[in-house]
Amino acid sequence: EDWQCPRTPYAASRDFDVKYVVPSFSAGGLVQAMVTYEGDRNESAVFVAIRNRLHVLGPDLKSVQSLATGPAGDPGCQTCAACGPGPHGPPGDTDTKVLVLDPALPALVSCGSSLQGRCFLHDLEPQGTAVHLAAPACLFSAHHNRPDDCPDCVASPLGTRVTVVEQGQASYFYVASSLDAAVAASFSPRSVSIRRLKADASGFAPGFVALSVLPKHLVSYSIEYVHSFHTGAFVYFLTVQPASVTDDPSALHTRLARLSATEPELGDYRELVLDCRFAPKRRRRGAPEGGQPYPVLRVAHSAPVGAQLATELSIAEGQEVLFGVFVTGKDGGPGVGPNSVVCAFPIDLLDTLIDEGVERCCESPVHPGLRRGLDFFQSPSFCPNPPGLEALSPNTSCRHFPLLVSSSFSRVDLFNGLLGPVQVTALYVTRLDNVTVAHMGTMDGRILQVELVRSLNYLLYVSNFSLGDSGQPVQRDVSRLGDHLLFASGDQVFQVPIQGPGCRHFLTCGRCLRAWHFMGCGWCGNMCGQQKECPGSWQQDHCP
């Protein structure tokens, strides 16, 4: 019988304990927010917020500028000073709740937990390949704001998500904030609102449209806004909230809220429940029929997909897909099955489901007993009636009022439970060649870069490495700058190449040469490496 090389098990062909050192920046405090800017003249920047401070970094993560954003009432607070002589409110630390780019100006907008959640606008001033912040403008006009009506109160101390959309000659801020009774009573930031930035940068135009959790539900019904994004004609918010206004408030589920990005109004506000499940190939006795529900969204990102995943999802290559990491409950603790699952929701399908839900509510014959929903925002009503009314009047349209779509959108774990005990805390999806890669941060401070495919019974790793020695959780928000992703963990910001940090974790030549083309791996004597690491022979074609 012919002797054959013993086959190296797949898992033995790689070593995830290999140390990779990636560029990093120590922010001097827990990173609270981070955003990147890439201009059209090769200038770029990374903005990093910690308590009471905003750092401006160059593309090399070297400090370019640093600005004191607090404490409020402190003479050293540089942003506070933009609001003129104080006091402007109770003194206290400024935790950055919002850090977004207004691409139209371009400018950076930061909003904090202090000073009624007001925002500051910092024009971006390019200088070579670096970017500096101009003196901040205080987006607050004292005479326009009252505790019950405050267009300039944007950020909630409980959390706020903002997406900026250019419309006409203004920037519109699509804002979603978590509220409770105390926050709502003091310069209420509202739950969902669309605010127009005034041309003179003195704040936001009064008379903005908004939805807010009704006062009677504020104590028991809290909405966490996990993610927001703009694609096509819509702005989307992703929420985790109680499944019902009347039932157990700890029974949570995930919803997608959709708002028009072309009309600054909320009549066409729609919500849809997103249902993500783990459906093992072999179902255990007693396991739920449709798979085990993972109702709580932890992180999300939307991205166009590569050819292979597009085929598996039955959509066209390059179409936008919303990816979410879901857990079984708020603590994300262990249950039966994996700790984290990843579900994919094609945006076009989401929109179709929403539009069909509107038809069911508004087109006759309407199914009797179909509710408009969103009873935490508006008076209960049945379709096709407007909120709180028994019937439609001739000059109102059923479509011009907020609606919870009656069906949910169900998906199963793309990874078939293979993430196992890993607790994913950050997600960013990129398309590399025709491959779709999920870049994930974890609770124990690691980065996993994994191809998104659903047909396999093992994970296709680009990399799996530790960001540092601290083992602190990777934070939710990830930013892209050129061919790198920026992850935050503890007080550090790390710059990770989207192609992976290197090839040294591939241990065998065969595995090395089977790595994705975009990784640029080759065999280099007795190790796998990129060409720049190999002074001698570097081989991409065949193994010795």
Epitope: L105, E166, G168, Q169, A199, S260, T262
Partner: antibody, heavy 121, light 107 residues
Framework: QVQLVQSGAEVKKPGSSVKVSCKAS????????MNWVRQAPGQGLEWIGR????????RYNEKFRDRVTITADKSTSTAYMELSSLRSEDTAVYYC??????????????WGQGTTVTVSS | DIQMTQSPSSLSASVGDRVTITCLAS??????LAWYQQKPGKAPKLLIY???SLADGVPSRFSGSGSGTDFTLTISSLQPEDFATYYC?????????FGGGTKVEIK
């Protein structure tokens, strides 16, 4: 009645600069955006950029960004558009136009009479 | 940049005719669309804003319709003073862009 009155026709050599003025009357210059639009002979309209005179904040069409400067003089209620490194294809009628909000929406509601700029060696 | 495609580029019509001009945006712009009329040697004049709203002093025979990507300007009964070139303009995202124009000539 709102009026925008522009400076007279200009003939310029290639490589030189031109500065066109637009004087506003019967409204407060600093309350509205001022836009500049051009129209080459027999061609359509092309937006160059805008200024908000209240803060001097400008926004330019990327196509012109290297060569155009839009400014405003509040004391004389006049807006200016300067175009540098002129070439023959910059021969056009240049218009200033105020843009205003109508409810949530924007439109260019008042236009200057136009300034003809001819670039020729 | 958002491209605006206007059609037809020219048309011949008689006084009293109903005239329709269309404008197609390369991406959705909601109702951030304006229509202008321009006569030879003159500056453009605003006719319609927000896709459907008539500007002050514009006769009611002019009307606009559409939202998203497809827009129409209609002149219900053409008058002698309506022979001109008509332009659509999107004001959703900068750079604001115009259609190529439609010249309405006397038949």
């Amino acid at each position: 009645q709102v009026q925008l009155v522009q400076s007279g026709a200009e003939v310029k050599k290639p490589g030189s600069s031109v500065k066109v003025s637009c004087k506003a009357s019967d409204y407060t210059l600093t309350d509205f955006y001022m836009n500049w639009v051009r129209q080459a002979p027999g061609q359509g309209l092309e937006w160059i950029g805008r200024i908000y005179p209240g803060t001097d904040k400008t926004r330019y069409n990327e196509k012109f960004r290297d060569r155009v400067t839009i400014t405003a003089d509040k004391s004389t209620s006049t807006a200016y558009m300067e175009l540098s490194s002129l070439r023959s294809e910059d021969t056009a009628v240049y218009y200033c136009a105020r843009s205003a909000y109508y409810g949530n929406y924007v439109a260019m509601d008042y236009w200057g009479q136009g300034t003809t700029v001819t670039v020729s060696s | 940049d958002i491209q605006m495609t206007q059609s037809p580029s020219s048309l011949s019509a008689s006084v009293g005719d109903r005239v329709t001009i269309t404008c197609l945006a390369s991406q959705t712009i909601g109702t951030w669309l304006a229509w202008y009329q321009q006569k030879p040697g003159k500056a453009p004049k605003l006719l319609i804003y927000a896709a459907t709203s008539l500007a002050d002093g514009v006769p009611s025979r002019f009307s606009g319709s559409g939202s998203g990507t497809d827009f129409t300007l209609t002149i219900s009964s053409l008058q002698p003073e309506d022979f001109a070139t008509y332009y659509c303009q999107q004001l959703y995202n900068t750079p604001w862009t115009f259609g190529g124009g439609t010249k309405v000539e006397i038949k």
